[in-house]
Interface confidence: low
C-alpha cells in the first residue's frame, strides 16, 4: 500500500485546512491509527492528533478545539484531519504516520501554506497642476503573505515604480504612479490592481485624477463690428475660458466704471440699447485657485450720423 497526500496544502487565513492522508491499501488491509505531528526542521515533532480506529480522535492540548476529523462519510482508510481557523503560525511542515495491519507503518509529509490576503490602500499624491513636471499621482500599498502583486490600470500615460518591504511572515509592496499633469487627464480613472493567491479575484481601488489648470481667456461678441451701432439692442460680450476648478469671471472697464445699465451675468456682459457712451476698453478677468487670466477688448459704438468709421481692437493678455 501507499499514502496519498498533497505536497502543499494552501489555505486562506481564518479558513479551515484539510490535511489529507489516505492509505491506499490492498484488499483486507486495515488502518489501526494515524498520528499527525508538526514536523518543522529545528523543532521537536509536536503532536497534533491521534486517530485511532477503535478509540477515535485524541487531540493534543496545544490544538484542543482546532483539530477535527472531516465530516462523514469517512473511509476507514482515510486519516485526513481538519485544522480549524488557520493562522500564520500554522504554516509549516506536517507529518502523517499511518500504522496499518498487516503492512506496517507509512509516513508522509506535507507543507501547509497559509495565505494572508492583502488589504490594499491608495493614497493620492500632491495636488496636480498643469505645467508641473513628472509628479506623483498616487501610491498604492498592499501587505500580505506571500507578497501581493500591485499594478496599475489606466489610459493615462505615466511611469510606475515599486518597492517591497519584507516582514517576518509577510511582505508589503508599494507601487507609485508618476505622470506629467495635463488638462486632458481630468476625470480619468487611475486604478490600483492588487493580485494575490488568497483573493478569488483582483482587488481594485480607483482614484479619479484632478489636474488644476486655467485656459487662456478670450472674448466673443465683436466679430462683426458693424453690429455695434447706436440704438442696437441685445448687444453682449461673452468671456470664454475653462479650468479646473471651474473659474469665476469678473468684468471691468479699463477707462472708467461700467456704464449704467450694463449687466454683469457671470461670463457675460449685457448692454442696454447702445449709445456712444458704451465705447471703451472692457476687461474680462478669469480666475480659479490655480491661476488667473485677463482678456480685454475695445468697443467702438458707431454713430451713423458721424461720417468717420472707427476701428475695433482686440487684445488678450495673461
Amino acid at each position: 500500500g501507499e499514502l496519498e497526500t498533497s505536497d502543499v496544502v494552501t489555505v486562506v487565513l481564518g479558513q479551515d485546512a484539510k490535511l489529507p492522508c489516505f492509505y491506499r491499501g490492498d484488499s483486507g488491509e486495515q488502518v489501526g491509527q494515524v498520528a499527525w505531528a508538526r514536523a518543522d526542521a529545528g523543532e521537536g515533532a509536536q503532536e497534533l492528533a491521534l486517530l485511532h480506529s477503535k478509540y477515535g480522535l485524541h487531540v493534543s492540548p496545544a490544538y484542543e478545539g482546532r483539530v477535527e476529523q472531516p465530516p462523514p462519510p469517512r473511509n476507514p482508510l482515510d486519516g485526513s484531519v481538519l485544522l480549524r481557523n488557520a493562522v500564520q503560525a500554522d504554516e509549516g511542515e506536517y507529518e502523517c504516520r499511518v500504522s496499518t495491519f498487516p503492512a506496517g507503518s507509512f509516513q508522509a509529509r506535507l507543507r501547509l501554506r497559509v495565505l494572508v490576503p492583502p488589504l490594499p490602500s491608495l493614497n493620492p499624491g500632491p495636488a496636480l497642476e498643469e505645467g508641473q513636471g513628472l509628479t506623483l499621482a498616487a501610491s498604492c500599498t498592499a501587505e500580505g503573505s506571500p507578497a501581493p502583486s500591485v499594478t496599475w490600470d489606466t489610459e493615462v500615460k505615466g511611469t510606475t515604480s515599486s518597492r517591497s518591504f519584507k516582514h517576518s511572515r509577510s511582505a508589503a509592496v508599494t507601487s507609485e504612479f508618476h505622470l506629467v499633469p495635463s488638462r486632458s487627464m481630468n476625470g480619468q480613472p487611475l486604478t490600483c490592481v492588487v493580485s494575490h493567491p488568497g483573493l478569488l479575484q483582483d482587488q481594485r481601488i480607483t482614484h479619479i485624477l484632478h489636474v488644476s489648470f486655467l485656459a487662456e481667456a478670450s472674448v466673443r461678441g465683436l466679430e462683426d463690428q458693424n453690429l455695434w451701432h447706436v440704438g442696437r439692442e441685445g448687444a453682449m460680450l461673452k468671456c470664454l475660458s475653462e479650468g479646473q476648478p471651474p473659474p469665476s469671471y469678473n468684468w471691468t472697464r479699463l477707462d472708467g466704471p461700467l456704464p449704467s445699465g450694463v449687466r454683469v451675468d457671470g461670463d457675460t456682459l449685457g448692454f442696454p440699447p447702445l449709445t456712444t457712451e458704451h465705447s471703451g476698453i472692457y476687461v474680462c478677468h478669469v480666475s480659479n485657485e490655480f491661476s488667473s487670466r485677463d482678456s480685454q477688448v475695445t468697443v467702438d459704438v458707431l454713430d451713423p450720423q458721424e461720417d468717420s468709421g472707427k476701428q475695433v481692437d482686440l487684445v488678450s493678455a495673461s
Epitope: 479558513q15 479551515d16 484539510k18 484488499s27 472531516p70 465530516p71 462519510p73 473511509n75 482508510l77 482515510d78
Partner: antibody, heavy 117, light 107 residues
C-alpha cells in the same frame, strides 16, 4: 471498469413500500460507500443516505428517517434502498452512487418509482 | 442544512463561448464541493471534485475554483455536447445537499 446496475422501474400505490437494488462490480465493494439520491420529475437532486458495506454503517437524511432502510449484501456486492409509506411526492428516479471517500464518482443508471393510486 | 444556491438557473450560449456557473453555500464548506453534469434522461456524471480537481476523463475545457462559500464551474470553450444540466454539491456536512441546477442551452 466500475459499474452500478440498478433494478427496473416500479409502480406502487400510496402507503406501499418499494425496494430498489444496486449491484456493484469492477471494484472492492466493501471499501467504498454507496449513496442513494433521488430526483423528482423536472427537479433537482436530493440525498437520501449512505451505507458503508465494509462495516454496514449507515447514515440517513433526517427527512427520510423512519421511512428508509439501506442495506448491503457483501456476498452479492449489492446494496438496497427500501422506502416505506410511499406517497405521491415520492415519485422520482432513484440513483445509487459510489463515493471515494467524499465524492460520488460513479452512478447507477437510475430506477423510476411511480406512486399512484 | 447547508443550502447550495446556483446561478443562473438557465444559461444560453453559443459554441466556443466561455461559460461560468456559480454556486454559493449558506456557510463555509471548505473546498468540499463537487460538480456534476446530467444529460437528458441520464444519470449525473462527476465533473469536478474538491472544487478544482477534474475527474478522470473530463475534458480540460472544464475547470472549477472556489473555497469557503463561493464556487465556480467554467467551460472555457463551449461544445455542442455540453448541453446538459449542471449541479453543484457540498460533501462537507450531512445531509449532503445539491444546488437546484443550471440548465445550459446551446444557441
Amino acid at each position: 471498469q466500475v459499474q452500478l446496475v440498478q433494478s427496473g422501474s416500479e409502480l406502487k400505490k400510496p402507503g406501499a413500500s418499494v425496494k430498489v437494488s444496486c449491484k456493484a462490480s469492477g471494484y472492492t465493494f466493501t471499501s467504498y460507500y454507496i449513496h442513494w439520491v433521488r430526483q423528482a420529475p423536472g427537479q433537482g437532486l436530493e440525498w437520501i443516505g449512505w451505507i458503508y458495506p465494509g462495516n454496514v454503517n449507515t447514515k440517513y437524511n433526517e427527512r427520510f428517517k423512519g421511512r428508509v432502510t439501506i442495506t448491503a449484501d457483501k456476498s452479492t456486492n449489492t446494496a438496497y434502498m427500501e422506502l416505506s409509506s410511499l406517497r405521491s411526492e415520492d415519485t422520482a428516479v432513484y440513483y445509487c452512487a459510489r463515493s471515494n471517500p467524499y465524492v460520488m464518482d460513479y452512478w447507477g443508471q437510475g430506477t423510476s418509482v411511480t406512486v399512484s393510486s | 442544512d447547508i443550502q447550495m444556491t446556483q446561478s443562473p438557473s438557465t444559461l444560453s450560449a453559443s459554441v466556443g463561448d466561455r461559460v461560468t456557473i456559480t454556486c454559493r453555500a449558506s456557510q463555509s464548506v471548505n473546498n468540499d464541493v463537487a460538480w456534476y453534469q446530467q444529460k437528458p434522461g441520464k444519470a449525473p456524471k462527476l465533473l469536478m471534485y474538491y472544487a478544482s480537481n477534474r475527474f478522470t476523463g473530463v475534458p480540460d475545457r472544464f475547470s472549477g475554483s472556489g473555497y469557503g462559500t463561493d464556487f465556480t464551474l467554467t467551460i472555457s470553450s463551449l461544445q455542442a455536447e455540453d448541453l446538459a444540466i449542471y449541479f453543484c454539491q457540498q460533501a462537507y456536512r450531512s445531509p449532503y445537499t445539491f444546488g437546484q441546477g443550471t440548465k445550459l442551452e446551446i444557441k
